[in-house]
Interface confidence: low
């Protein structure tokens, strides 16, 4: 079998999720001494960077600017090191948001409830979609789909405290394009002393591991930094 | 080493189409980046165009989309601006810039052509 | 749009002493800003971009700083050829726009 390096991380800075006609960047870990990084979009080569120096940066960003429905889908990178090649990384999906229309995201029985109760969320959007996200900001990764035809419902079942935080919900016109986000909704739940922590209510639903980790390294030392390659030129 | 430089008339009536041509020395327009008008009255600051990229798409300030076209000859390795029906408004260096900078966005421009003054008047 | 507001529009300093430009943006950018400098019947030269990186061959005595809404361009010790007019610029979503300059004089 032919020999390939490991396979390189690759993560969205901030968020996945990009309103339409913003800048997305992509970073691609990968090793030191890499010289080129591919990034690639639903299979085909979409942008190269070569860092500089390459054996003191073991990363690079790829900037994706005027964020639209043509550059949302599945990106992934590679790397080489000399003439020997990475294996891909895995697949890491890109949104654009703010697309079209607003959803109403309502609650019921009602934003304060306590804990035991079964709880539903409706995510309503009377133009054409069929499938409805609702995310908890904080937790982007963890989205909920539901499908209807103007409206979806989401039931939580019996909450507890772990389910207090701000909830938001996207209409999605295909998998990789979706609309504004609704206005926030606040679930409080009441009654349950074990976990009493709030959820993180920064409207861009950032994820702690969705910043770019790149290190450089300076004679003998790492510095973890939020590396931009650039930086060294 | 880029280079860019801009040529078209220095003068052009109102109501008419300004054109100017940016010929790209050093880089093939086709290799990457996007290729970008911007423009500064006398006087005055500076106002981004529009853009052509790499692989021929193109984006447009807002404030002109009505009016402007930009193309590309990639045989000639050269870029192109059409404006329709100027005004004295449109009276103004007209430069031409890489976008797309060691990683950075499109939107940084490090290469640009010295500019060409168009004045609109009858 | 995203609007850009620099301070001051123009300012007089000697040579040697610290200047110090501003740029207030109307919307989070987060660090997609370029400074650029632009003398009399030149085009605009880039300076820093992404906020803090220096372009090449851009002398150490310019540096940028801030993130979000609010950036600053600092000249740490003016020299006679760095008189000349200082642009900022977004480069987050497009349409990118500049701020209106800020002329630098000799004093």
């Known amino acids: 079998p032919k020999q390939t390096l490991p396979k390189p991380i690759i993560r969205a800075e901030s968020t996945y999720m990009v309103p339409k006609e913003k800048q997305a960047t992509l970073c691609c870990q990968g090793s030191y001494g890499a010289v080129e990084y591919q990034l690639h979009f639903e299979g085909s080569l979409f942008a190269v960077e070569r860092p500089k120096p390459p054996e003191r940066i073991n990363g690079v960003k790829f900037h994706i600017p005027d964020m639209n429905s043509r550059k949302a889908g599945r990106y992934s990178c590679i790397y080489r090191v000399g003439e020997l090649w990475s294996e891909r990384s895995d697949l890491l999906d890109l949104v654009v948001t703010e697309m079209y229309d607003t959803p109403t995201l309502s609650v019921h029985p009602g934003p304060e409830v306590t804990s035991g109760e079964k709880v539903t969320f409706y995510c309503r959007l009377d133009t054409a979609t069929s499938m409805f996200l609702l995310l908890k900001e904080g937790r982007s990764r963890d989205v909920q789909r539901s499908y209807g035809k103007v409206q979806a419902e989401f039931p939580m079942g019996p909450v507890t405290t772990a389910h207090r935080g701000s909830y938001r919900c996207f209409g999605s016109y295909n998998n990789y394009a979706w609309s504004f986000p609704s206005e926030p909704v606040k679930l409080l739940v009441t009654g349950d002393i074990e976990n009493t922590s709030l959820a993180p209510t920064d409207p861009t639903f950032p994820d702690s591991w969705d910043t770019c980790l790149l290190t450089r390294e300076t004679g003998l030392q790492k510095d973890l930094a939020l590396w931009d390659h650039t930086a060294q030129n | 080493q880029v280079q860019l430089q801009e040529s078209g008339p220095g003068l052009v009536k109102p109501s008419q189409t300004l054109s100017l041509t940016c010929t790209v020395s050093?880089?093939?327009?086709?290799?990457?980046?996007?290729w970008n008008w911007i423009r500064q009255p006398p006087g005055k600051g500076l106002e981004w165009m529009g853009y052509i990229t790499y692989s021929g798409s193109t984006s447009y300030n807002p404030s002109l989309e009505s009016r402007i076209t930009i193309s590309r000859d990639t045989s000639k390795n050269q870029f192109s601006l059409k404006l329709s029906s100027v005004t004295a408004a449109d009276t103004a260096v007209y430069y031409c810039a890489r976008g797309g900078y060691y990683g950075s966005s499109w939107g940084v421009f490090a290469y640009w052509g010295q500019g060409t003054l168009v004045t609109v008047s009858s | 749009d995203i609007q850009m507001t620099q301070s001051p529009s123009s300012l007089s300093a000697s040579v040697g002493d610290r200047v110090t430009i501003t740029c207030r943006v109307s919307?989070?950018?987060?660090?997609?800003l370029a400074w650029y400098q632009q003398k009399p019947g030149k085009a605009p030269k880039l300076l820093v971009y992404n906020a803090k990186t220096l372009a090449e061959g851009v002398p150490s005595r310019f540096s940028g700083s801030g993130s979000g809404t609010d950036f600053t361009l600092t000249i740490s010790s003016l020299q006679p050829e760095d008189f000349a007019t200082y642009y900022c610029?977004?480069?987050?979503?497009?349409?990118?726009?500049f701020g209106g300059g800020t002329k630098v004089e000799i004093k």
């Open positions: 050093g880089y093939s327009i086709t290799s990457d980046y996007a």
């Open positions: 610029q977004h480069h987050y979503g497009t349409p990118w726009t």
């Open positions: 919307e989070n950018i987060y660090s997609y």
